[in-house]
């Protein structure tokens, strides 16, 4: 399973070495869900770096939920020695790297990049602005990271991404962060945009960890996750500058079902945290 091979780096405390997650969902907060059952389950706590017990309501929630302590450990923990070593893994290119350049049916003349399987290099092309295919990147760097081989014939990064064919916004399938990329910001910046379960359509921003940008999305008004900001600036402040941030233990606050903006005092500076 390619997910097994990929690791995710989050630094959550100044005293601790970089945390490498085997699966991105290990970074999700424990989510009891909206139902009212009382079920003992386990989740991986990125702050204590341990699997811990929580009470699950019986429906919805997220993937950071395990029937047993052993299952949680198996999915989310590794010995520290493995965690600290950066690994460059031989990985397959995503299938879309082998698609031919496709300008799409519109004519907007946007400069984009595609991986040319003949030359084995990323090259510039004129994109029409709509449709086309997934071999289509906003930057040369993005194209190289995803489709070109590294110096030893290794795949540099395999993001496991889904490219919206028109927005050409890379949306992580399971928010995989490339194994060579040390993200020092809040863990929720690595989670995918989550609309939530209600019916509103509020304009919000989320941090897309694959392309390193804050992107708009529509929030339903309830549920979702903490990768949810009312402005682009707020999103950038919390996630884009994550390369220099360290989070003290206990940085997240869990409140019941209300999503209100709260200021959380953190050791190094104030950042905004969204609560479920």
């Amino acid at each position: 399973d390619s997910e097994e091979d990929e690791e995710h780096t989050i630094i959550t405390d100044t005293e601790l070495p970089p945390l490498k997650l085997m699966h991105s969902f290990c970074a999700f907060k424990a989510d009891d869900g909206p139902c009212k059952a009382i079920m003992k389950r386990f989740f991986f706590n990125i702050f204590t770096r341990q699997c811990e017990e929580f009470i699950y309501g019986g429906c919805e929630g997220n993937q950071n939920r395990f029937e047993s302590l052993e299952e949680c450990k198996k999915m989310c923990t590794r010995d520290n020695a493995n965690r600290i070593i950066k690994t460059t893994l031989q990985q397959e290119k995503p299938d879309f790297c082998f698609l031919e350049e496709d300008p799409g049916i519109c004519r907007g003349y946007i400069t984009r990049y595609f991986y040319n399987n003949q030359t084995k290099q990323c090259e510039r092309f004129k994109y029409g602005g709509c449709l086309g295919n997934m071999n289509n990147f906003e930057t040369l760097e993005e194209c190289k990271n995803i489709c070109e081989d590294g110096p030893n014939g290794f795949q540099v990064d395999n993001y496991g991404t889904q490219l919206n064919a028109v927005n050409n916004s890379l949306t992580p399938q399971s928010t995989k962060v490339p194994s060579l990329f040390e993200f020092h910001g809040p863990s929720w910046c690595l989670t995918p945009a989550d609309r939530g379960l209600c019916r509103a359509n509020e304009n919000r921003f989320y941090y897309n960890s694959v392309i390193g940008k804050c992107r708009p999305f529509k929030y339903s008004g309830c549920g979702g996750n903490e990768n949810n900001f009312t402005s682009k600036q707020e999103c950038l402040r919390a996630c884009k500058k994550g390369f220099i941030q360290r989070i003290s233990k206990g940085g997240l606050i869990k409140t019941k079902r209300k999503r209100k903006k709260q200021r959380v005092k953190i050791a190094y500076e104030e950042i905004f945290v969204k609560n479920m």
Epitope: D102, C106, R107, C130, L131
Partner: antibody, heavy 123, light 112 residues
């Protein structure tokens, strides 16, 4: 003024091939500012896009997954037309079939449509 | 596939009165440059569809200014400021954000 004139049989037997042609006047099938599509309409499915072809530096096509294994859309530059072939038809393929021009420059939409051809799949 | 959901499916109208049709997409249709990848079509009885509104809010050539399109993200609206008898037919929204191109199920506008 662009015009699209459709032709082809209205009755096709199950398992056979549905073939329709769309003759273009007022534009060129090789134009790099247009794309050419087939869309069908049936009471059960509403408007269903089937596929599209377009010429840029070369010819491109895209097909709906639902018909991808059975469909071919081809340009005929000498006659300035394009055709639809749908293989192994079943009664489910009974519909009104439209050809349409996608305006790649201004509208980014289907701005001209053929008159429609009702195709019935029945033995 | 992106699912386009229109409401209402049937809209009885009075000539001279305004009318509004809603279209909701299962994912956002807004591109990073601000373009909205949504079109509106009208299919009059016995005719082929015709393009009314492109890129979410632009009227196609020859379309009267009583028609207007608005919305962004996943929620879009087609408004007719004062309905005329010739406006009857079925209205469809269509997305071109990703393949396959998909249409709404249609809203039938008829005179009361």
């Amino acid at each position: 003024q662009v015009q699209l004139q459709q032709s082809g049989p209205g009755l096709v037997k199950p398992s056979q091939t549905l073939s329709l042609t769309c003759a273009i006047s007022g534009d060129s099938v090789s134009s790099n500012s247009a794309a050419w599509s087939w869309i069908r309409q049936s009471p059960g499915r509403g408007l269903e896009w089937l596929g599209i072809i377009y010429k840029r530096s070369k010819w491109y096509n895209d097909y709906a997954v639902s018909v991808k294994s059975r469909i071919t859309i081809n340009p005929d530059t000498s006659k300035n037309q394009f055709s639809l072939q749908l293989n192994s038809v079943t009664p489910e393929d009974t519909a009104v079939y439209y050809c349409a021009r996608w305006d790649s420059d201004k509208h980014w939409g289907f701005d001209y449509w053929g008159q429609g051809t009702l195709v019935t799949v029945s033995s | 596939d992106i699912v386009m959901t229109q409401s209402p499916l049937s809209l009885p109208v009075t000539p001279g009165e305004p009318a509004s049709i809603s279209c909701r997409s299962s994912q956002s249709l807004v591109f990073s440059d601000g373009n909205t990848y949504l079109n509106w079509y009208l299919q009059k009885p016995g005719q082929s569809p015709q393009l009314l509104i492109y890129k979410g809010s632009n009227r196609a050539s020859g379309v009267p200014d009583r028609f207007s399109g608005s919305g962004s993200g996943t929620d879009f609206t087609l408004k007719i400021s004062r309905v005329e008898a010739e406006d009857v037919g079925v209205y469809y929204c269509q997305q071109y954000d990703s393949y396959p191109l998909t249409f709404g199920q249609g809203t039938k506008v008829e005179i009361k």
